[in-house]
């Protein structure tokens, strides 16, 4: 269950529930947010003030990371099995340090197993954080400091810092270093959505939300 | 320098087991996955399976699932490729081939191969 | 599964000449590309991979290009130690699949 059921069950606070992993009794705690366009949105990435170290493990990756009231990641085996499970959606919401928001939208969003390293993939971009999507397409697979998967014979997670669907960079790492503001330019490694904010630009703050397409 | 050495082959009745072994020296065993490849005599490559670097996650073609399996000692630096029900199919040079990452699919380094012969 | 078709399966050059090998997929495999060398008796080496990144040790008389589902291998000028066979593989999903092979020869 995920936070559109926990909205429909009359839960419609925002805040920290025990979600269940599907098909199994597997628990994991996440945010939910039940207010932005009409709630039941489950936030499976937050950054917001550099107090969690996303350079970390393919494991960790994984199995989630952080603190869901702050900065974390929610897990990317409990996103594959959710996603895999019916359709979703995937908002990006992003500010920059000058007080403007974004977002982009993909009507269709899910990951792969971790046999194809969690790949991603994407449909139907909107939104108003650039016409073209700064997640390559078609979708690579995931990468990590320790599990190099990407397209460059840099390595891109080493090299740009935090796990992330590299391709050879790519045009995108909402998981890379968190830099504060006045340092937040030219920086190669920062929290990069290259479509909106271009290459050298560390963004403020971050949440990637998914919710049922059918919500 | 990355070394892969393969070991165990030989020549095997059909329908028995054989048990051929990698060596591997020369960089962090533990932090790749491994594969293993065969090619007929005279014919083209076949990739047969892969485990990760932690041993948690192996996946096979259907030509030799459920008769084959792979597996590692890190403590050893050893790789494993145990095969079962042999038929005279199976015959080829099996090697053994280091990942370029924990599980990246891209195959890295190759061992000189051992020789598996099925014939009664 | 995704099945690789190599072309030609054997091709007859002499030293200096420029060389091209295709490789198509059946299906998009997105980059995830590589190529192989193998020498008569000898284990297969890593070319290329993604397509078009050179490994270590490689000489940039290599090359590689391609998207979707068609893939080349290209050899700017042959040399005498670059007659063998060469193969590509998808590693875009299990299982990996490879190309028959291109054997090159001198002629």
């Known amino acids: 269950r995920d936070c559109a059921e926990v909205f429909k069950s009359g839960h419609t606070t925002n805040g920290i529930y025990t979600l269940t992993f599907p098909n199994s009794t597997e628990e994991i705690k996440a945010y939910c947010d039940m207010e932005a366009g009409g709630g039941g949105w489950t936030i499976i990435q937050r950054r917001e003030d550099g107090s969690v170290d996303f350079q970390r493990t393919w494991k960790e990756y994984k199995v989630g990371f952080g603190n869901p009231s702050g900065e974390y990641w929610l897990g990317n085996e409990f996103v594959s099995q959710l996603t895999n499970q019916q359709r979703y959606v995937l908002k990006i919401h992003l500010k920059d340090w000058e007080g403007n928001e974004a977002y982009s939208l993909y009507e269709h969003f899910y990951l792969s197993s971790e046999e194809l390293n969690y790949r991603i993939h994407l449909k139907g971009l909107t939104g108003t954080a650039g016409k073209i999507s700064s997640i390559s397409q078609p979708g690579n697979d995931f990468s990590t400091k320790d599990g190099d998967n990407d397209k460059c014979i840099c390595k891109c997670s080493q090299m740009l810092t935090g796990g992330w669907w590299f391709d050879a960079c790519g045009p995108s790492n909402l998981n890379g270093m968190y830099y504060p503001q006045r340092q937040n330019t030219n920086k190669f490694n920062g929290i990069k959505w290259y479509y909106w904010k271009g290459s050298g630009y560390s963004l403020k703050a971050t949440t990637m939300m998914i919710r049922p397409a059918d919500f | 320098q990355v070394k892969l050495v393969e070991s165990g082959g030989g020549v095997v009745q059909p329908g028995r087991s054989l048990r051929v072994s990698c060596a591997a020296s020369?960089?962090?065993?533990?932090?790749?996955?491994m594969h293993w490849v065969r090619q007929a005599p005279g014919k083209g490559l076949e990739w047969l399976a892969i485990i990760w670097y932690d041993g948690d996650n192996k996946y096979y073609s259907d030509s030799v699932k459920g008769r084959f399996t792979i597996s590692r000692d890190n403590s050893k630096n050893t790789l494993y490729l145990q095969m079962n029900s042999l038929r005279a199919e199976d015959t080829a040079e099996y090697y053994c081939?280091?990942?370029?990452?924990?599980?990246?699919?891209?195959?890295?380094?190759w061992g000189q191969g051992t020789l598996v012969t099925v014939s009664s | 599964d995704i099945q690789m078709t190599q072309s030609p399966s054997s091709l007859s050059a002499s030293i200096g000449d420029r060389v091209t090998i295709t490789c198509r997929a059946t299906q998009d495999i997105n980059n995830y590309l590589a190529w192989f060398q193998q020498k008569p008796g000898k284990a297969p080496k890593s070319l290329i991979y993604?397509?078009?990144n050179l490994q270590s040790g490689v000489p940039s008389k290599f090359s590689g290009s391609g998207s979707g589902t068609d893939y080349t291998l290209t050899i700017s000028s042959l040399q005498p130690e670059d007659f063998s066979t060469y193969y590509c593989?998808?590693?875009?999903?299990?299982?990996?699949?490879f190309g028959g092979g291109t054997k090159v020869e001198i002629k």
């Open positions: 081939v280091r990942d370029a990452s924990i599980a990246s699919r891209f195959l890295d380094y």
């Open positions: 020369g960089f962090t065993f533990s932090s790749y996955g």
């Open positions: 593989q998808q590693y875009h999903s299990y299982p990996l699949t």
């Open positions: 993604a397509t078009s």
